[in-house]
């Protein structure tokens, strides 16, 4: 049975050319986690394997740093990078946990975080 | 440099036996999950089995399921197929191939030619 | 099971042609598709992974595109040593599942 839960930073937003932090956290679960994906819609931006390491996907090298932990730092904001990022948490025995993160990028320097929430 | 090797194919009859087998060199194979790919003669490709790097997780084909079992053993870098009950509709080029991130399969063995035929 | 449909099944062009080649799942499987090569008697060999990330030592003629259901792999200019058989392959979910296939000959 799955009883464990994502908490993420959900909504969040930040400056146009800044960067912003992508986290997520796995909790009330005794099941090793054995990679966490990250996507961007239908994109995949990197892969973080307890075995390998981790993997940036080419085309967002330049933008894209891992970590810290298992989360994503995403740099050279743009307005595009607006939308929703999920983090994708395998783990053993349990199975898949998803967490969601909703970026807003401003023009305006005016940017807060807003605040966590839990996805069951 | 990177080397799957697979061996272990062979005639067999319907209802019989055969373990392949897939020696890995040149990469830490206990990274990495494994996979079973297959090509009958002039046909497509079909993945038959997965296994994870610790073999914590196997995952079959729906048609092989009950009959083909995956292993592994990391000491060896050695990955294996057992295959009992053969049919037929297995007769195939069995391939075995690296997946990192379980996401693509980056590099493949020659293939082994396994015949089910009385 | 995910079905992934590739067409054409087969296809003639000239040396310096853009071939392009479409595959399409039956749901969505975000960007978890990768491209094969394959020729007679040999390993299928990777080309493309993650609809869009060109293997390392694979010429840049090849390109991937597309997201959700719909993909596409196009040689910008085909070469003598590129007329062979292409599968797409999804990875989102087992069981993992193959394209039929796109046989690409000589003109």
């Known amino acids: 049975m799955m009883t464990g839960t994502i908490e993420t930073t959900g909504n969040i937003s930040a400056e146009k050319g800044g960067s912003i932090i992508l986290q997520c956290h796995l909790s009330s679960t005794t099941a090793q986690v054995t990679q966490v994906n990250w996507e961007q819609q239908d994109q995949l931006l990197a892969i973080c394997n307890a075995d390998l390491g981790w993997h940036i996907s080419p085309s967002f090298k330049d933008r894209v740093a891992p970590g810290p932990g298992l989360g994503l730092t995403l740099q050279s904001l743009t307005v595009n990078d607006t939308g929703e990022y999920f983090c994708i948490y395998h783990t053993y025995p349990d199975g898949t946990y998803t967490g969601r993160i909703f970026l807003e990028v401003l023009e305006s320097s005016v940017a807060e975080h807003g605040a966590r929430f839990q996805i069951p | 440099e990177v080397q799957l090797l697979e061996s272990g194919g062979g005639l067999v009859q319907p209802g019989g036996s055969l373990r392949l087998s897939c020696a890995a060199s040149g990469f830490t194979f206990s990274s990495y999950s494994m996979h079973w790919v297959r090509q009958a003669p002039g046909k497509g490709l079909e993945w038959v089995a997965s296994i994870k790097s610790s073999s914590s997780n196997k995952y079959y084909a729906d048609s092989v399921k009950g009959r083909f079992t995956i292993s592994r053993d990391n000491s060896k870098n050695t990955l294996y197929l057992q295959m009992n009950s053969l049919r037929a509709e297995d007769t195939a080029v069995y391939y075995c191939?690296?997946?990192?991130?379980?996401?693509?399969?980056?590099?493949w063995g020659q293939g082994t030619l396994v015949t089910v035929s009385s | 099971d995910i079905q992934m449909t590739q067409s054409p099944s087969s296809l003639s062009a000239s040396v310096g042609d853009r071939v392009t080649i479409t595959c399409r799942a039956s749901?969505?499987?975000?960007?978890?598709l990768n491209w094969y090569q394959q020729k007679p008697g040999k390993a299928p060999k990777l080309l493309i992974y993650?609809?869009?990330s060109l293997q390392s030592g694979v010429p840049s003629r090849f390109s991937g595109s597309g997201s959700g259901t719909d993909f596409t792999l196009t040689i910008s200019s085909l070469q003598p040593e590129d007329f062979a058989t292409y599968y797409c392959?999804?990875?989102?979910?087992?069981?993992?599942?193959f394209g039929g296939g796109t046989k690409v000959e000589i003109k």
């Open positions: 191939a690296r997946g990192p991130y379980d996401v693509w399969l980056d590099y």
């Open positions: 993650a609809a869009s």
């Open positions: 392959q999804q990875s989102y979910s087992t069981p993992l599942t």
């Open positions: 749901q969505s499987i975000s960007s978890y």
